[in-house]
């Protein structure tokens, strides 16, 4: 299975002695090593963190370990004005105030630079008005709204639940509906899981806990004012009103105490139904403004955060391929936390040192993988994803004619309950075969493979006997790789029963209580979890290193893309009459899958027959799996969208966490029935239609024999 | 172990100032939100003052408003509270106390209390 190029390690043994010098132990000590203070980024702290990793990886044996910096657009409060949220009388004053700080965690009163809640990119306001509470501030809540309670946002302040999407789309979404400030908040419907005590005496949030995070729509485009290039000592930057993805209105975010003063005197409309209310005793009525006794009460907004140009750094270790270093395989995780990092990002950054460590144990006894492996610790992940963004946009010629995969490294943990994992389908074999191999950390699993204790609890929606893998989606430092450069990416973690834990993430994310104790005390305290999942991400770096015949399978790609078809198909149905109408044909999409799947079928037969020690046709033969999933890349991109270029999957419209299939089509299709001129409605899914279809063939194609 | 210290307290003639202070020790002040209460002689207590665990909001009972004023330095670990214009009425034991929940937005129950400091308005 694996090359014996440049190796005093017989085959057998390689992946061996790789997973058996992966420890427990050290991931934890590396967790609280990186989790003592604040790293966000842009600052001092987090600089001298990416020198001391820059340091270790050197003294792990990496070949070379160079620091990579960009001057970006980041986003600061304003330490002498801070940012808060009143409830104010007739008379102008303010009778209510939001908290200025989270109430720090026991052991940690005295840190400095703790980075209040606040909601990155928020322009400067203080706008004041009525409250209108919207659920989640999905694109069917104010649907919900504005279409069939005839509430009018325009001129609100809007008050959102955390939760369900990515906030940066709530935020798009109030902007749209004409609201003039979001209030973003933690419901304990969503963040406190019943049963658990809060933190610090169990993992749920605290009423003064509060969720930071970026705001931004940027679809890809990484730093907000200078998209497509990097952000380099020569750059050209846009002025701020030509900046992408920059919200218009001012936001913060809350927790629940201070969500409990606000909706706790709201009038107006009832609730439209149950899945409207939340957890806190106050009546979630929608508004707009305060009930009866307080109607001439209003809400005030003060925000005074900066946008700054600052610089940010990325650590880059290279361990070089002894056979083929030209091609890359990257596994690539953020350093940069909003405070401690406890989970995100330090459980993943963790993992990531120890696989470095397992590495240059290995290389340091003679052994080398067949490909270059290149190792990232991504700056300023929080605000955009803009540290992997700005490398790549720098690197994007090597990238997308050397890049084999992608392996992201965030977050190892976002609960304890079974793996989860997203990747392309071309990793679906390679993530199957992997699990098989590796033992179970779950508690009735001792002895099964990870693959059994996985499938039992997250069994495949389709395929009985396997487990569920998802689409990719974005929200983290693969979106470059995957949407833009068309690399084949793949993430894996531990994750929480979605059966009984219907709160979204974890309940502690981006506030100042994801702490090393967090994990310590309540999530992981043997980091087996943590363990199982350096074997999983290093396991598949090493595999896809590694193996001779690069571990691909393009026929799970053609089961997929008729799923995906037929997906599309059904929803196009939901309007026969305009298909007929306008001559709607999937055919052409239809022939193209099917074309697919038999040259898929065909290529895996060559492959299996192939005379592997002739380098030419081996070179040739990875050279046509390494380049299908860029095969997937228009070079125009999606509308309205030009960095999500993959035909197959982009970040959903709705929800930037979420992966959407087919998305040209889907969001062609998305409301179509309330769009004004219908004719050139469906003639834009005609274009999409169109587009998918000739991607997949030309796909396709390029796994038919060369000549 | 944790206490909490109050003083400052005195004789003062109505219409004058005085300024209590409250040192917290064995528990990080900032992260609760505390108060002033106070018992008149013969009498039962009377909360006084609130202020939450980063000085965002201030609560008064009406007896007070405008008058006192509650205020901390969480660097110090103490509470303060200013009292101006002082009558006799103002008369009382001043205990500061540690409101039960962190991070509470509005008063709540008390469960740390201090020893008292005494308060004497006369002319």
């Known amino acids: 299975k694996s090359s014996n190029e440049a190796t005093n390690i017989t085959p057998k043994h390689n992946m061996k002695a790789f997973l058996d010098e992966l420890k427990a132990e050290n991931i934890k000590k590396f967790l609280y090593n990186f989790t003592q203070i604040p790293h966000l980024a842009g600052t001092e702290q987090n600089f001298q963190l990416a020198k001391q990793i820059q340091s270790q990886w050197k003294e792990f044996g990496l070949d070379s370990v160079e620091l990579a910096h960009y001057d970006v657009l980041l986003s600061y409060p304003n330490k002498t004005h801070p940012n808060y949220i009143s409830i104010i009388n007739e008379d102008g004053n303010e009778i209510f105030n939001t908290s200025l700080f989270e109430p720090p965690p026991p052991g940690y009163e005295n840190v400095s630079d703790i980075v209040p809640p606040f909601s990155a990119f928020s322009p400067q306001g203080m706008p004041e008005g009525d409250l209108v509470y919207v659920n989640y501030a999905r694109t069917e809540d104010f649907f919900k709204l504005e279409r069939d309670m005839k509430i009018n946002c325009s001129g609100k302040i809007v008050i959102a639940r955390y939760g369900k999407v990515f906030r940066g789309n709530k935020v798009k979404n109030a902007q749209l509906a004409g609201a003039k400030g979001v209030i973003l908040y933690s419901d304990p419907a969503d963040y406190f899981a019943p049963g658990v005590k809060s933190y610090p005496d169990g993992w749920n949030l605290p009423g003064g806990g509060v969720q930071r995070g970026n705001i931004l729509n940027l679809n890809g485009a990484g730093d907000p004012l200078t998209p497509g290039y990097p952000a380099n000592e020569y750059a050209y930057r846009r002025g701020i009103a030509e900046a992408v993805g920059l919200p218009s209105i001012p936001v913060h975010p809350i927790g629940y105490y201070d969500a409990q003063k606000l909706l706790e005197k709201m009038g107006g409309s009832a609730p439209p139904d149950s899945s409207w209310r939340g957890s806190l005793k106050v009546p979630y009525n929608v508004g707009p403004g305060f009930t009866g006794n307080f109607s001439t009460q209003k809400v005030k907004m003060h925000i005074h955060s900066t946008n700054e140009v600052t610089r940010i750094y990325n650590v880059i270790g290279t361990l070089r391929g002894a056979v083929e270093p030209d091609r890359y395989v990257i596994l690539g995780g953020h350093r940069d936390s909003w405070v401690f990092g406890g989970i995100d990002p330090q459980s993943g950054a963790a993992v990531v040192h120890e696989i470095v460590r397992s590495f240059g144990t290995l290389k340091k006894e003679g052994w080398r993988p067949r490909r270059t492996i290149l190792f990232a610790s991504w700056d300023a992940e929080e605000f955009g994803l803009l540290g992997s963004t700005e490398w790549a946009e720098e690197n994007s010629r090597l990238l997308q004619e050397r890049g084999v995969a992608y392996i992201n490294a965030d977050s190892s943990i976002e609960g304890n309950y079974t793996l989860r994992v997203d990747c392309t389908p071309l990793m679906y074999s390679l993530v199957h075969n992997l699990t098989k191999e590796l033992k179970s950390p779950d508690e009735g699993f001792e002895g099964k493979s990870l693959y059994e204790s996985w499938t039992k609890k997250s069994p495949s929606p389709e395929f009985s006997g396997m487990p569920r893998i998802s689409k990719l989606g974005s929200g983290n430092d693969f979106e470059v790789f995957f949407q833009r450069l068309g690399i084949a990416s793949g993430r894996a973690r531990y994750t929480k029963n979605w059966e009984t834990n219907k709160f979204s993430g974890y309940p502690l994310y981006h506030s100042v209580y994801e702490t090393y104790e967090l994990v310590e005390k309540f999530y992981d305290p043997m980091f087996k979890y943590h363990l199982t999942v350096a074997q999983v991400r290093g396991g598949m770096v090493f595999e896809l290193a590694n193996s001779i015949v690069l571990p691909f399978d393009c026929r799970d790609y053609a089961v997929v893309l008729r799923k995906y078809a037929d997906k599309i198909y059904s929803i196009s149905m939901k309007h026969p009459q305009e298909m007929k109408t306008y001559s709607v044909s999937f055919d052409s999409l239809f022939s193209a899958v099917k074309n697919f799947t038999e040259i898929a079928s065909k290529f895996s037969e060559r492959l299996q027959d192939f005379d592997k020690s002739n380098p030419i046709v081996l070179r040739m033969m990875n050279d046509q799996l390494m380049f299908l999933e860029r095969a997937f890349i228009d070079p125009l991109g999606l509308p309205d969208r030009p960095f999500y270029r993959h035909v197959i999957y982009a970040p959903s419209s709705h929800n930037k966490y979420a992966g959407e299939s087919f998305p040209g089509i889907y969001d062609a299709l998305f409301d179509i029935e309330s769009k004004v001129d219908p004719s050139k409605a469906w003639g834009e899914v005609k274009r999409q239609i169109y587009v998918a279809a000739f991607t997949v063939q030309a796909a396709a194609e390029t796994l038919s024999e060369v000549a | 172990e944790v206490q909490l210290v109050e003083s400052g307290g005195g004789v003062v003639q109505p219409g004058r100032s005085l300024r209590l202070s409250c040192a917290a020790s064995?528990?990080?002040?900032?992260?609760?939100?505390m108060n002033w209460v106070r018992q008149a002689p013969g009498k039962g207590l009377d909360w006084v003052a609130f202020?939450?665990?980063?000085?965002?909001?201030?609560y008064y009972a009406d007896s007070v408003k405008g008058r006192f004023t509650i205020s901390r330095d969480n660097s110090k670990n103490t509470l303060y509270l200013q009292m101006n214009s002082l009558k006799p009425e103002d008369t009382a034991v001043y205990y500061c106390?540690?409101?039960?929940?962190?991070?509470?937005?509005?008063?709540?129950?008390?469960?740390?209390w201090g020893q008292g400091t005494m308060v004497t308005v006369s002319s």
């Open positions: 106390a540690k409101d039960r929940i962190v991070g509470a937005r509005v008063p709540d129950a008390y469960d740390i």
């Open positions: 064995g528990f990080p002040l900032i992260s609760y939100g």
């Open positions: 202020i939450t665990y980063d000085g965002s909001n201030r």
